[in-house]
Interface confidence: low
Amino acid sequence: SLGSLAAAEPAVIAECKTRTEVFQISRNLIDRTNANFLVWPPCVEVQRCSGCCNNRNVQCRASQVQMRPVQVRKIEIVRKKPVFKKATVTLEDHLACKCETVVTPRPVT
Amino acid sequence: SLGSLAAAEPAVIAECKTRTEVFQISRNLIDRTNANFLVWPPCVEVQRCSGCCNNRNVQCRASQVQMRPVQVRKIEIVRKKPVFKKATVTLEDHLACKCETVVTPRPVT
């Protein structure tokens, strides 16, 4: 909101770089055919590019990515009892970022 | 995806805590009546609660927040020339988080 400038520090741009984000492990990453299970943990940390670039024609994008397999628990409920199984979910970490020109398609004339 | 567990580390829960996020400073935070200006910087870092809790009945919520005024530039375009003005945007930082019970209304019987 607009207001008094007293005690207001100059805003600093959130530069384009990797930051820690939370990734929700959805059940359909594990098994699309069955809904009768839980996944543990439900979310994990990943590294993702975020932030702003100097103008609107460029966007902060990952210039280097790495796939990271992690082991999760698939907890199936069988006769009201938990049966623990294992599954691997492959996470995508961003290792480096850059401000990349956004190519917008020209309208056909 | 289900797959080989070779080289897969056990997934670690993204605990409920503050993390650095990027907040886009939208123009209508500065001036709802006029669209003929730019804001600098277009985004800043804020601290926000994120992550998962031990079960689905609780959610990661901020238990302590702090409002932080920051000074931004409002760049109006007047006769194709930039006119620099100042404005204050108040950001909300989360200082502490907790896993809070989600109260879901019971169905009326």
């Epitope: 839980l38 543990w40 082991q71 938990p82 623990f84 294992k86 | 031990n54 079960n55 009945n57 609780v58």
Partner: antibody, heavy 120, light 107 residues
């Protein structure tokens, strides 16, 4: 400081009943799964039962299924084990233990235990 | 049910010794293995969870390793207060089961 204090143990005849209690303090009891683990004299550890944080899910060892009932009262920070149709082989020290989140299935903090003796 | 087999059932060691206790599961349990220490007349205490994660407040001379069916608890330099019985426990599936225990005695 986390504290778990069991009570209710004692001498009971075969076929009799006992109700064990566990008073919890020093942590948010309602957020944690809880368990009972027992240890017969000079023997190893045996898992007995586990209950979910809200109390809606309960799990039992086959050796006690149908005879023992685990329950909790989150308003009172208390865990219970109702033991019916007791047998000589149920003689043991019974420990209550905090079992973490909903799939941790470990025993993080333990009480000091309460001795149950089933004998005629 | 998953059977957990510990070896040895007892061992004698001196202060300063490196001690290794093994635990074998009857089927693969990934890294869902926990270790406990119990002293006479006392409740057990969690030392290691998820095969290799040290519980808060546990001295760093304790370490755990292994995955699948074979696991190890190592005490790098045995201290007087470490003479106790150690149990492994699988948290892979119910019923939750413990190993038979390993008693570490003073030589």
């Amino acid at each position: 400081e986390v504290q778990l204090v069991e009570s209710g143990g004692g001498l009971v005849q075969p076929g009799g009943s006992l109700r064990l209690s566990c008073a919890a303090s020093g942590f948010t009891f309602s957020s944690y799964w809880m368990s009972w683990v027992r240890q017969a004299p000079e023997k190893g550890l045996e898992w007995v039962s586990t209950i979910s944080d809200g109390g809606g899910l309960t799990y039992y060892a086959d050796s006690v299924k149908g005879r023992f009932t685990i329950s909790r009262d989150n308003a009172k920070n208390s865990l219970y084990l109702q033991m019916n149709s007791l047998r000589a082989e149920d003689t043991a020290v019974y420990y209550c233990a905090e079992s973490g989140g909903y799939t941790d299935w470990l025993f993080g903090y333990w009480g000091q235990g309460t001795l149950v003796t089933v004998s005629s | 049910d998953i059977q957990m087999t510990q070896s040895p059932s007892s061992l004698s060691a001196s202060v300063g010794d490196r001690v290794t206790i093994t635990c074998r599961a009857s089927q693969s349990i990934s890294s869902y293995l926990n270790w406990y220490q119990q002293k006479p007349g006392k409740a057990p205490k969690l030392l290691i969870y998820a095969a290799s994660s040290l519980q808060s407040g546990v001295p760093s001379r304790f370490s755990g390793s292994g995955s699948g069916t074979d696991f190890t608890l190592t005490i790098s330099s045995l201290q007087p207060e470490d003479f106790a019985t150690y149990y492994c426990q699988q948290s892979y599936s119910t019923p939750l089961t413990f190993g038979g225990g390993t008693k570490v005695e003073i030589k």
